[in-house]
C-alpha cells in the first residue's frame, strides 16, 4: 500500500469516488474526490514488477496451492481416522490456505490488467482480509503444530480425545482472533481511483489520513502479537525438540524420526525466512516511512515481500508431508497416479515381512497410521 493523496477540497474524506454521472470530458471522467500518487509509486503500479512478476508468482501459488491444500484437507477430514492435534492443526492450516488461494484468480487478473480492480469494493475487502488472515492464521497454526510436535516428544502418552478437543478449541480461538484482528481490513475502503493512471487500485493505494497513524499502529501490533511472539514460541519448540532428539537413543526408527523432524524444522524455517519475516518487517517499515516522510522508499520491496508471503500456501504441503503419514501416502500416490487401495494391496503381498519388523506407528496403511513422531 502506498500513500494516496486526497485532493478533495471538501476536506480529507476517506472515500475516493469516481462520479461517472458528472461532467464527462471526452474519454475521461470527472472525479469528485481524487487521490494522487508520487512518480515512483506510479512507476511500480504500471511497471513489470506488479503487472508481470506478481501474476506469475500468484499463478504458481494458485496452481500448486489449490490442489495440494485441497487434497490435504480431504485427507485430514476423510482419510485420517484418528484426529490427533497435529491433524487438526494441519487441517486448519490447509483450510486457511484454501480460503486465501481461491481468490487468487481475481488477484492475478487485477495485476495483469495493470492493477485495475473491476470487481467492486466488497470483493476487494474480502480478498485483502483473507490475504492477511491467511498469513496470520498460518503463523498461529504453525506455532500450534510446532509446540504440539515438541509436546509429543516430551510427553508421548496422553489422553488422545482430550488432546483433540483442546486442539479444536485452540483452532476455533485462532479463527475468532484472526476474524477480530482483520476486521479493520474489511471495514476500511480499499479501492481507490487514481486519475493519473486511470486505474482503481485494491489495497495498493490507501488514503493518506488512514495510513499516517492507523495502518502503522495496526501492522506494528500484528507484527509483535501475531508474528514475533508466535515466532519465538516456534523457535523455542524446535530448539527444545532438537535437544530432545539429540539426547535420545539412536535406533533405526528414532533416526528416521530425527531426519523427518529436521526436514520439518528446515521447512518451517524456510517459511519464516521467505514468507513471514520479510512481509511483517516490511509492512512495519513501509508504514513507518509513510507516517514519518509521507512516502515509502521500500514500496517495491514491500510489494515483493507481500507477494512472497503467499508462497506459504505452497510450502505448507511440505509440512503436511513431513508430519502426516496419510498425506505422505496420498501425495506419493497422487503424483504417481496410483490409488491408495492398489498400493496397499501391493504392500500387503510384497512387503509383509519387511512391515513386521517396523514399528506399528510407521505402518504404511493410510487408514491406521499415527501422525505423531
Amino acid at each position: 500500500t502506498i500513500q494516496g493523496t486526497n485532493r478533495s477540497s471538501k476536506g480529507r474524506s476517506l472515500i475516493g469516488k469516481v462520479d461517472g454521472t458528472s461532467h464527462v470530458t471526452g474519454k475521461g471522467v470527472t472525479v469528485e474526490t481524487v487521490f494522487s500518487v508520487d512518480e515512483f509509486s506510479a512507476s511500480v503500479l504500471t511497471g513489470k514488477l506488479t503487472t508481470v512478476f506478481l501474476p506469475i508468482v500468484y499463478t504458481i501459488v494458485f496452481v500448486v496451492g489449490l490442489p495440494s491444500n485441497g487434497m490435504a484437507l480431504w485427507v485430514f477430514l476423510f482419510r485420517t481416522k484418528k484426529k490427533h492435534p497435529a491433524v487438526i492443526y494441519m487441517a486448519n492450516l490447509a483450510l486457511a490456505d484454501l480460503l486465501s488461494v481461491i481468490w487468487f484468480p481475481l488477484k492475478i487478473a487485477y495485476h495483469i490488467h495493470g492493477n485495475n480492480w473491476i470487481y467492486g469494493e466488497a470483493l476487494c475487502n474480502v480478498l485483502i482480509g483473507f490475504f492477511y488472515g491467511n498469513m496470520y492464521c498460518s503463523i498461529l497454526f504453525m506455532t500450534c503444530l510446532s509446540v504440539q510436535r515438541y509436546w509429543v516428544i516430551v510427553n508421548p502418552m496422553g489422553h488422545s480425545r482430550k488432546k483433540a478437543n483442546i486442539a479444536i478449541g485452540i483452532s476455533l480461538a485462532i479463527w475468532l482472533l484472526i476474524l477480530l484482528v482483520t476486521i479493520p481490513l474489511y471495514v476500511v475502503k480499499q479501492t481507490i481511483f487514481i486519475p493519473a493512471l486511470n486505474i482503481t487500485t485494491c489495497h495498493d493505494v490507501l488514503p493518506e489520513q488512514l495510513l499516517v497513524g492507523d495502518m502503522f499502529n495496526y501492522f506494528l501490533s500484528l507484527a509483535i502479537g501475531v508474528f514475533l511472539f508466535p515466532a519465538f514460541l516456534t523457535a523455542s519448540a524446535y530448539v527444545l525438540m532438537i535437544r530432545m532428539l539429540r539426547s535420545s537413543a539412536m535406533d533405526e526408527n528414532s533416526e528416521k524420526k530425527r531426519k523427518r523432524a529436521i526436514k520439518l524444522i528446515v521447512t518451517v524455517l524456510a517459511m519464516y525466512l521467505i514468507c513471514f519475516t520479510p512481509s511483517n518487517l516490511l509492512l512495519v517499515v513501509h508504514y513507518f516511512l509513510i507516517k514519518s516522510q509521507g512516502q515509502s522508499h521500500v514500496y517495491a520491496l514491500y510489494i515483493v515481500a507481500l507477494c512472497l508471503s503467499t508462497l506459504n500456501s505452497c510450502i505448507d504441503p511440505f509440512v503436511y508431508y513431513f508430519v502426516s503419514h496419510d498425506f505422505r501416502d496420498h501425495a506419493k500416490n497422487a503424483l504417481l497416479c496410483r490409488s491408495v487401495r492398489t498400493v496397499k494391496q501391493m504392500q500387503v503381498s510384497l512387503t509383509s515381512k519387511k512391515h513386521s519388523r517396523k514399528s506399528s506407528s510407521y505402518s504404511s496403511s493410510s487408514t491406521t497410521v499415527k501422525t505423531s513422531y
Epitope: 512518480e39 486511470n198 516522510q293 509521507g294
Partner: antibody, heavy 119, light 106 residues
Framework: QVQLVQSGAEVKKPGSSVKVSCKAS????????VIWVRQAPGQGLEWMGV???????YYAQKFQGRVTITADESTSTAYMELSSLRSEDTAVYYC?????????????WGQGTLVTVSS | EIVLTQSPATLSLSPGERATLSCRAS??????LDWYQQKPGQAPRLLIY???SLATGIPARFSGSGSGRDFTLTISSLEPEDFAVYYC????????FGGGTKVEIK
C-alpha cells in the same frame, strides 16, 4: 522548448460563459496534466482544476458545476470553460503544466488571460 | 482543507540582504511544498519544489527548508530582480496556495 500560450483577454457579461484556451508546445498533452489557476486583481492565487493526460478531470469544490476543463490532443490545446459568470470572476486565468504525480510541481505556466465580467 | 499561512505579509529589505520567508501549514504536509515567484503582470515562476529542490534555471541563492508544517524560503543575497511576491503551494492534500509575501525594496 516547453511553452504554454493562452488566448487573449475577454470581456463578458454576468451570467454568460467564457472559454479560455491554452496551447501547449514542446510536450505532449497525453503525458502531462494541465492545471488552471486564477488570480483576482490584487489578490492571491487560487487553484481551480486539473485535466490529466488521459482525460480525467478534477475541480476544486468552489468551482464544481461551473467549470469544465477539456483538452484536444490533435491541436495540443487545453480549455477551461467557466459558466454563470459573476463580477467576482473577474481575474487573470493561468494554465500550467503538471506531470500528474504527487511529487511534481507546476513547472511551466501560460502568460495568463484576463477575463473581465462587467454589465 | 489545508490552510497555508505566509509571514510576513510584506518584507522590506535592501539589495544584498538575506531574505527569510515563512510558510506554515495547518497540518502535516511532509515535504510537499513548492515556492513560486510572481512579478507584476507576469505569470508565477517555479523556484523550489518538494521543500528544497531547486527548479531548473533558478539561481543558487534561492533555497528551501523545513518539513511537516513549517517551511522557509531563503534568498541568501537579494538581487534587484528578486523583489516580487512569493507564494507557497502545498500539494500533499489538495492544492492550496499561501496568501503571499511581498518582498519590497527598503
Amino acid at each position: 522548448q516547453v511553452q504554454l500560450v493562452q488566448s487573449g483577454a475577454e470581456v463578458k457579461k454576468p451570467g454568460s460563459s467564457v472559454k479560455v484556451s491554452c496551447k501547449a508546445s514542446g510536450f505532449s498533452l497525453s503525458s502531462y496534466g494541465v492545471i488552471w489557476v486564477r488570480q483576482a486583481p490584487g489578490q492571491g492565487l487560487e487553484w481551480m482544476g486539473v485535466i490529466w493526460g488521459n482525460g480525467n478531470t478534477y475541480y476544486a469544490q468552489k468551482f464544481q458545476g461551473r467549470v469544465t476543463i477539456t483538452a484536444d490532443e490533435s491541436t495540443s490545446t487545453a480549455y477551461m470553460e467557466l459558466s454563470s459568470l459573476r463580477s467576482e470572476d473577474t481575474a487573470v486565468y493561468y494554465c500550467a503544466r503538471w506531470r500528474g504525480y504527487k511529487d511534481y510541481p507546476f513547472d511551466y505556466w501560460g502568460q495568463g488571460t484576463l477575463v473581465t465580467v462587467s454589465s | 482543507e489545508i490552510v497555508l499561512t505566509q509571514s510576513p505579509a510584506t518584507l522590506s529589505l535592501s539589495p544584498g540582504e538575506r531574505a527569510t520567508l515563512s510558510c506554515r501549514a495547518s497540518q502535516n504536509i511532509y515535504k510537499y511544498l513548492d515556492w513560486y515567484q510572481q512579478k507584476p503582470g507576469q505569470a508565477p515562476r517555479l523556484l523550489i519544489y518538494n521543500t528544497n529542490s531547486l527548479a531548473t534555471g533558478i539561481p543558487a541563492r534561492f533555497s528551501g527548508s523545513g518539513s511537516g508544517r513549517d517551511f522557509t524560503l531563503t534568498i541568501s543575497s537579494l538581487e534587484p530582480e528578486d523583489f516580487a511576491v512569493y507564494y507557497c503551494l502545498q500539494h500533499n492534500s489538495g492544492w492550496t496556495f499561501g496568501g503571499g509575501t511581498k518582498v519590497e525594496i527598503k
